[in-house]
Amino acid sequence: LIQERRSHEVNPAAHLTGANSSLTGSGGPLLWETQLGLAFLRGLSYHDGALVVTKAGYYYIYSKVQLGGVGCPLGLASTITHGLYKRTPRYPEELELLVSQQSPCGRATSSSRVWWDSSFLGGVVHLEAGEKVVVRVLDERLVRLRDGTRSYFGAFMV
Amino acid sequence: LIQERRSHEVNPAAHLTGANSSLTGSGGPLLWETQLGLAFLRGLSYHDGALVVTKAGYYYIYSKVQLGGVGCPLGLASTITHGLYKRTPRYPEELELLVSQQSPCGRATSSSRVWWDSSFLGGVVHLEAGEKVVVRVLDERLVRLRDGTRSYFGAFMV
Amino acid sequence: LIQERRSHEVNPAAHLTGANSSLTGSGGPLLWETQLGLAFLRGLSYHDGALVVTKAGYYYIYSKVQLGGVGCPLGLASTITHGLYKRTPRYPEELELLVSQQSPCGRATSSSRVWWDSSFLGGVVHLEAGEKVVVRVLDERLVRLRDGTRSYFGAFMV
């Protein structure tokens, strides 16, 4: 897989930010802001939470999610899974790319029920044109979005 | 915003490291080592804690801070905020770019008074020539800076 | 150190993934999968856990490790150190590049002795041809490998 950087060519990159509409509660991936504030798309496109690859190559993909809660109600999982997943036309199921598991509720104590934690993922993966990358968090109810600086998703060709 | 990589052109990059002088206690941003050891500047400059952009474009900016303490004298509710912020001549206040909140004191236990935690931030942002990026941590006294490998700040054009 | 990106030139990059054989228990660095699944080498080589640089330059190097355990046996260190280290023919000892310390055992609670934590490192360093970068985790017994998506190691030239 020879990949070249030709001069005068724009290098694909994107940074998508968390927004009030990011958490759907539908079991789907997180949704993202693509234009306002710090968000942008350059040489990549977006569809239903997914970064869509236009140009095949190796990409450094990344995501950060801000987690937070008040205590840890029994209805919430004690383990949070944050991952980047690939959707490809060549395969029916999503493929795990980069994943983290955390137990942030250990940060809530009897004298401090409010807790905060952050999960960052980043790594280089090969993506073909038309393939999509999404972010999932289980349990997404613990994701804190606020202003787009605390939870985000991006990529650039390397 | 079309950005090109022309052949024979140096790609701006920098990696700044923590040092004994990093914590000012003045309410300002963290200060950084720019030359010794692993630190360097290439196509970016530095001023009073800030990476200063020479060439406009999209940059992957990152920072890691090593947090630590002995027990939690401030109370377990204490939240640490670690962020990358932009200063621009076009706007009087700093703009949040990438931010994390953590509650590391939940990591101190009866069997282990000493606790350590780490916060990593990274993402792509557009920066104009003359704009500055700084790192802030509240409470900065919980940042370990001594050896330059545990707390650092960097960027490169993508 | 002027570094150029010439057109039609492949940009060195690699992403190595955790495997059952990664944890040697020998006191050496972690070992990695280089070909199967998401793993690849492009313009970099691999030897005994190390990414070996072919072309001198500035590289963004990164590693994530998934940590996990059941409670915190006294035999295990309460502090976990995860680091990227350089081996160079010009110096007999490994050099610390990027390091994190964490106290994940504070995440085990009375209601959930099983805990998970993740450590991510990334930063830009200059590497000469022939120099090697390795990942170490102390205590490596707490690293959870599974399928190559949770613990990994990579780099690309910037």
């Epitope: - | 090593q66 947090l67 630590g68 303490g69 002995v70 027990g71 939690c72 004298p73 401030l74 109370g75 009866s110 069997s111 282990s112 008074r113 000493v114 409470d139 006294r141 919980l142 940042v143 370990r144 800076l145 001594r146 | 006294l74 035999g75 295990l76 260190a77 309460s78 502090t79």
Partner: antibody, heavy 121, light 107 residues
């Protein structure tokens, strides 16, 4: 620089309460430190009694926990120790000490000169 | 509670000698160990923190090493002012504990 000075009665009757105060000068008690009490019986080693933070969080040695109370007076920039139901075994030099709790520098770096307390009728 | 055992309990040495004192913890304490020097009638003085970090203002003749359960304090070249009692202290776990002390005397 920060200095500590213990004060309190040098003689306490058995079954009574030992009360000591440590005045902090040259710095604020409202910082990221633990304020400790350590004692040393005559001719013996050091024993940690407990610690208090400026926010009033306390941790005590289990061997003394049922008899110890520590508190902070931020207005006066001082902290105190109360040890009740004392016996002759509590006779010792009592030191107050600051322990740094920040990331880069740990350890009990500042100590008072110590005050001798004798338990006797 | 974590027990700290120092050895030797006492030793005699001469000015200029290199001296090593060891401290063993009953369970792992990572690097959360400090060394103190105490002279008669005086409070302890912090020499080393985090097992190997030299406290500001302390002579570089003092050095510490170790991690986990085994630690050492080394005085590279004894000076007359070094004759005192030395204590190790663990601050990893509650309760904080001290070693029993090592008395360093002039030979």
């Amino acid at each position: 620089q920060v200095q500590l000075q213990e004060s309190g009665p040098g003689l306490v009757k058995p079954s009574g309460t030992l009360s000591l105060t440590c005045a902090v000068s040259g710095g604020s008690i409202s910082s990221i430190n633990w304020w400790n009490w350590v004692r040393q019986p005559p001719g013996k080693g050091l024993e940690w009694i407990g610690e208090v933070s400026h926010s009033g969080i306390t941790n005590y040695n289990p061997s003394l926990k049922s008899r110890v109370t520590m508190s902070v007076d931020k207005a006066k920039n001082q902290f105190s120790l109360k040890l009740n139901s004392v016996t002759a075994a509590d006779t010792a030099v009592y030191y107050c000490a600051r322990e740094r709790a920040v990331a880069d520098y740990h350890g009990m770096d500042v100590w008072g000169q110590g005050t001798t307390v004798t338990v006797s009728s | 509670a974590i027990q700290l055992t120092q050895s030797p309990s006492s030793l005699s040495a001469s000015v200029g000698d290199r001296v090593t004192i060891t401290c063993r913890a009953s369970q792992g304490i990572s690097s959360a160990l400090a060394w103190f020097q105490q002279k008669p009638g005086k409070p302890p003085k912090l020499l080393i923190f985090d097992a190997s970090d030299l406290e500001s203002g302390v002579s570089s003749r003092f050095s510490g090493s170790g991690s986990g359960t085994d630690f050492t304090l080394t005085i590279s070249s004894l000076q007359p002012g070094d004759f005192a009692t030395y204590y190790c202290q663990q601050f990893n776990s509650y309760p904080i504990t001290f070693g029993q002390g090592t008395r360093l005397e002039i030979k």
